[in-house]
């Protein structure tokens, strides 16, 4: 018996071939011997089966001795043994229809779980293997679960159902709702304007929700809400903003915040959350601000950084075009009795400069100038 696998909602064509290459009488029946369709001369006739409005054949092939049964918009319950009667012969074809669906919406928040459920006919014992867009393979039976979805899981999932050494492939498009970056860090000199950007990693027609930026300053004992906002059809409107600092927010996507001045008291970490309409859970992006200050007080030239720097970073003080006078894994370094000239304070990672601030040290009888 020939086995054919079909996909729920698809169309399947079951073949039936006569030895004579001409139009002769044929009938397609199901396992209960109920006629599905057949022919009378050159006319297609249909029986009383449940497939009535979904069954068809190709009259153009009859003259070549081919009498296919076409079933449209397949249902799981169409799984059956179909019998083609032609030239006193019976050809049996077993059709097995499978369906694969995502548990809920195919738009899921980062960190949520995706469950794929296989619908299969009674008596079948299929195995399923799914390949994620990032190439991860997941195997299972009737259900497949992927916990903690990541941004890279966005895209087309390809799932292969295997039964009787035959396979059928399903493609499911999954959209993981997330920010493009889970975390970002901004390095600024004291006094510079700071731009924070929170681009989304997905596009949807209408985007509605509300958001808030909580900030934990390094110098503060507790975090505070810096700004709350609403999002209506991709338009941003500020609901509430602190007086210090007075953040400004762009009116369009991507979400964009401006801090007028980088100051040591603002250095720290923030968490922007975005709650989307009709979605449980929130999107998160961490943002970090590191602020640098170079100062000269009497005979002491000091370079300091505030904020979440990593213990890998080097802080250096050097006279322009000379070797570093001091270079340490610290958040503050200093030079006593610095010689006159342009000094550079550098925050670097394996030689790559992340942040630089210059300070001019004048001969001892005059005061320093900050460019």
């Amino acid at each position: 018996k020939k086995v054919v696998l079909g996909k729920k909602g698809d169309t399947v064509e079951l073949t039936c071939t006569a030895s004579q290459k001409k139009s002769i009488q044929f009938h397609w029946k199901n396992s209960n011997q109920i006629k599905i369709l057949g022919n009378q001369g050159s006319f297609l006739t249909k029986g009383p089966s449940k497939l009535n409005d979904r069954a068809d054949s190709r009259r153009s092939l009859w003259d070549q001795g081919n009498f296919p049964l076409i079933i449209k918009n397949l249902k799981i319950e169409d799984s059956d043994t179909y019998i083609c009667e032609v030239e006193d012969q019976k050809e049996e074809v077993q059709l097995l229809v499978f369906g694969l669906t995502a548990n809920s919406d195919t738009h899921l928040l980062q960190g949520q779980s995706l469950t794929l459920t296989l619908e299969s006919p009674p008596g079948s014992s299929p195995s399923v293997q799914c390949r994620s867009p990032r190439g991860k393979n997941i195997q299972g039976g009737k259900t497949l679960s992927v916990s903690q979805l990541e941004l890279q899981d966005s895209g087309t999932w390809t799932c292969t159902v295997l039964q009787n050494q035959k396979k059928v492939e399903f493609k499911i498009d999954i959209v993981v709702l997330a920010f493009q970056k889970a975390s970002s860090i901004v390095y600024k000199k004291e006094g510079e304007q700071v731009e924070f950007s929170f681009p989304l990693a997905f596009t949807v027609e209408k985007l509605t929700g509300s958001g808030e930026l909580w900030w934990q300053a390094e110098r503060a004992s507790s975090s505070k809400s810096w700004i709350t906002f609403d999002l209506k059809n991709k338009e941003v409107s500020v609901k509430r903003v602190t007086q210090d600092p007075k953040l400004q927010m762009g009116k369009k996507l991507p979400l964009h915040l401006t801090l007028p001045q980088a100051l040591p008291q603002y250095a720290g970490s923030g968490n922007l959350t975005l709650a989307l309409e009709a979605k449980t859970g929130k999107l998160h992006q961490e943002v970090n601000l590191v602020v640098m200050r170079a100062t000269q007080l009497q005979k002491n030239l000091t370079c300091e950084v505030w904020g979440p720097t990593s213990p890998k970073l080097m802080l250096s003080l050097k006279l322009e075009n000379k070797e570093a006078k001091v270079s340490k894994r610290e958040k503050a370094v200093w030079v006593l009795n610095p010689e006159a000239g342009m000094w550079q304070c550098l925050l670097s990672d394996s030689g790559q400069v992340l942040l630089e601030s210059n300070i001019k040290v004048l001969p001892t009888w005059s005061t320093p100038v900050q460019p």
Epitope: I185, T309, K312, M314, K328, E330
Partner: antibody, heavy 129, light 113 residues
Framework: QVQLVQSGAEVKKPGASVKVSCKAS????????INWVRQAPGQGLEWMGI????????SYAQKFQGRVTMTRDTSTSTVYMELSSLRSEDTAVYYC??????????????????????WGQGTTVTVSS | DIVMTQSPDSLAVSLGERATINCKSS????????????LAWYQQKPGQPPKLLIY???TRDSGVPDRFSGSGSGTDFTLTISSLQAEDVAVYYC?????????FGQGTKLEIK
């Protein structure tokens, strides 16, 4: 398996240059720094410099400044150390070593530094007239 | 540059006995900002590259036997091998990575008595 494979032994004349390669395999090449350390016969270890394969940024010991150049080729996961104006005291075994650093910002959970945890087999450079 | 000085230069210890190697830095390698001692210990056997034993002055690298331990803070550090095994015969180096340039101690040769 994580490893660094270095180029073969070299014999050079004083004044010449030598270029030693260090190919990484089984290592996420751009995420970790590569140090160069040398060891003269019967002597201790001497740090020459560091390169970040991701951006190509470098930091050299002052002793080698102007004579050493560290470069990388991300397409082949290889870093190079070129030492010019060779003299007899440059005769040594030259090692590349992966300096592994893991962990986020200091505000986040633990910052883990793993030192120079993977070393190349060493390349012997002999400088002789 | 930070100068690292090890003592003794060589050491002979009986199998199963404790071996202690000291390392002194010319300035503190304890970062007050990150509260970490930027000090590592390496083991080098003849004809082989060095092998990382300890980082952050006291954290054992993965796969390093627990007979090796590191201690100390600021400028004074110690590597201890609680019960010497034959395979521990090697030269041991301390190294600071607090400041560029990184610097190594001159090495301590450990032998079996």
């Amino acid at each position: 398996q994580v490893q660094l494979v270095q180029s073969g032994a070299e014999v050079k004349k004083p004044g010449a240059s030598v270029k030693v390669s260090c190919k990484a395999s089984g290592i996420p090449f751009t995420s970790d720094d590569i140090n160069w350390v040398r060891q003269a016969p019967g002597q201790g270890l001497e740090w020459m410099g560091i390169i970040n394969p991701s951006g190509g940024s470098t930091s050299y010991a002052q002793k080698f400044q102007g004579r050493v150049t560290m470069t990388r080729d991300t397409s082949t996961s290889t870093v190079y150390m070129e030492l010019s104006s060779l003299r007899s005291e440059d005769t040594a075994v030259y090692y590349c070593a992966r300096e592994r650093y893991e962990g986020g910002y200091s505000s986040g959970p633990g910052n883990y530094y793993y030192g120079m945890d993977v070393w190349g087999q060493g390349t012997t450079v002999t400088v002789s007239s | 540059d930070i100068v690292m000085t090890q003592s003794p230069d060589s050491l002979a210890v009986s199998l199963g006995e404790r071996a202690t190697i000291n390392c002194k830095s010319s300035q503190s390698v304890l970062s007050s900002s990150y509260n970490k001692n930027y000090l590592a210990w390496y083991q080098q056997k003849p004809g082989q590259p060095p092998k990382l034993l300890i980082y952050w002055a006291s954290t054992r690298d993965s796969g390093v036997p627990d007979r090796f331990s590191g201690s100390g803070s600021g400028t004074d550090f110690t590597l201890t091998i609680s019960s010497l095994q034959a395979e521990d015969v090697a030269v041991y180096y301390c190294q600071q990575y607090y400041s560029i340039p990184y610097t190594f101690g001159q090495g301590t040769k450990l032998e079996i008595k």
